[in-house]
């Protein structure tokens, strides 16, 4: 659910970390209406997720750890 690179809502699916190659943070105070995590998947899809949800935080933490260890 995105428009002009802004997420307008959140996915109603849960994604597995193995499906995700990276993420971008969307901040409501930077020109978009809502805070979001935009997951970039192996199928070259961008998926808008709720940054407050535990599964989203978990994947962000995993990916951040991966980047740190590179």
């Amino acid at each position: 659910a995105s428009n002009f690179d802004c997420c307008l809502g959140y996915t109603d699916r849960i994604l597995h970390p193995k499906f995700i190659v990276g993420f971008t943070r969307q901040l409501a105070n930077e020109g978009c209406d809502i805070n979001a995590i935009i997951f970039h998947t192996k199928k070259k899809l961008s998926v808008c997720a709720n940054p407050k949800q535990t599964w989203v935080k978990y994947i962000v933490r995993l990916l951040s750890k991966k980047v740190k260890n590179m």
């Epitope: 994604l15 597995h16 499906f19 192996k42 535990t54």
Partner: antibody, heavy 120, light 107 residues
């Protein structure tokens, strides 16, 4: 040790609702998802949905949307699954199962199952 | 939704046999696959997670392999307690769909 204890068997009439409970012990209740899976007689396993006890977030199988509601009570470490507008095809054993990020989103502990019979 | 197809649906084998059960996904699930064992009247038990990892307490005669759309559960030497029904499960994306099951029976 981790234990999931479910409520007892239920017999319901078509159109009624059923609420099954699952009491967790032996681990930090809010650190793991709780899934609900059912198995109808002679059928395979079917995933109904999950609840994240930490924030009440739910994710339901579209097949049950509008009929299933999952809730939790952190004070008693109990999750509930309510299924409404019951029909004969809902006759099944219903399981709660702990969802664990650490085992690749696997369901590593299961309740003993609750048989729900829908019959007029 | 991702569809999971197991084969065979039933299988007769003897104690000591090597047995292979396959599971195919309708699309690439990138190894996000788990295997469960279910015995009559008992709750399912997690055997393999992440396609290849053995769950706690599961004997080493069980192993999982595969990638992309195709996955395999192997029991290297069947024991009497292994006769049960086995299910694969997609966990790539909700809904977390199961295969229809493979019933392993004594020959």
């Amino acid at each position: 040790q981790v234990q999931l204890v479910q409520s007892g068997a239920e017999v319901k009439k078509p159109g009624a609702s059923v609420k099954v409970s699952c009491k967790a012990s032996g681990y930090t209740f809010t650190s793991y998802w709780m899934h609900w899976v059912r198995q109808a007689p002679g059928q395979g396993l079917e995933w109904m949905g999950l609840i994240d006890p930490s924030d009440k977030y739910t994710n339901y199988n579209q097949k049950f949307k509008g009929r299933v509601t999952m809730t939790r009570d952190t004070s008693t470490s109990t999750v509930y699954m309510e299924l409404s507008s019951l029909r004969s095809e809902d006759t099944a054993v219903y399981y709660c199962a702990r969802g664990n990020y650490g085992v690749d989103y696997g369901m590593d502990y299961w309740g003993q199952g609750t048989l729900v019979t829908v019959s007029s | 939704d991702i569809q999971m197809t197991q084969s065979p649906s039933s299988l007769s084998a003897s104690v000591g046999d090597r047995v292979t059960i396959t599971c195919g996904a309708s699309e690439n699930i990138y190894g996000a696959l788990n295997w469960y064992q279910r015995k009559p009247g008992k709750a399912p038990k997690l055997l393999i997670y992440g396609a290849t990892n053995l769950a706690d307490g599961v004997p080493s005669r069980f192993s999982g392999s595969g990638s992309g759309r195709d996955y395999t559960l192997t029991i290297s030497s069947l024991q009497p307690e292994d006769f049960a029904t086995y299910y694969c499960q997609n966990v790539l994306i909700t809904p977390y769909t199961f295969g229809q099951g493979t019933k392993l029976e004594i020959k």
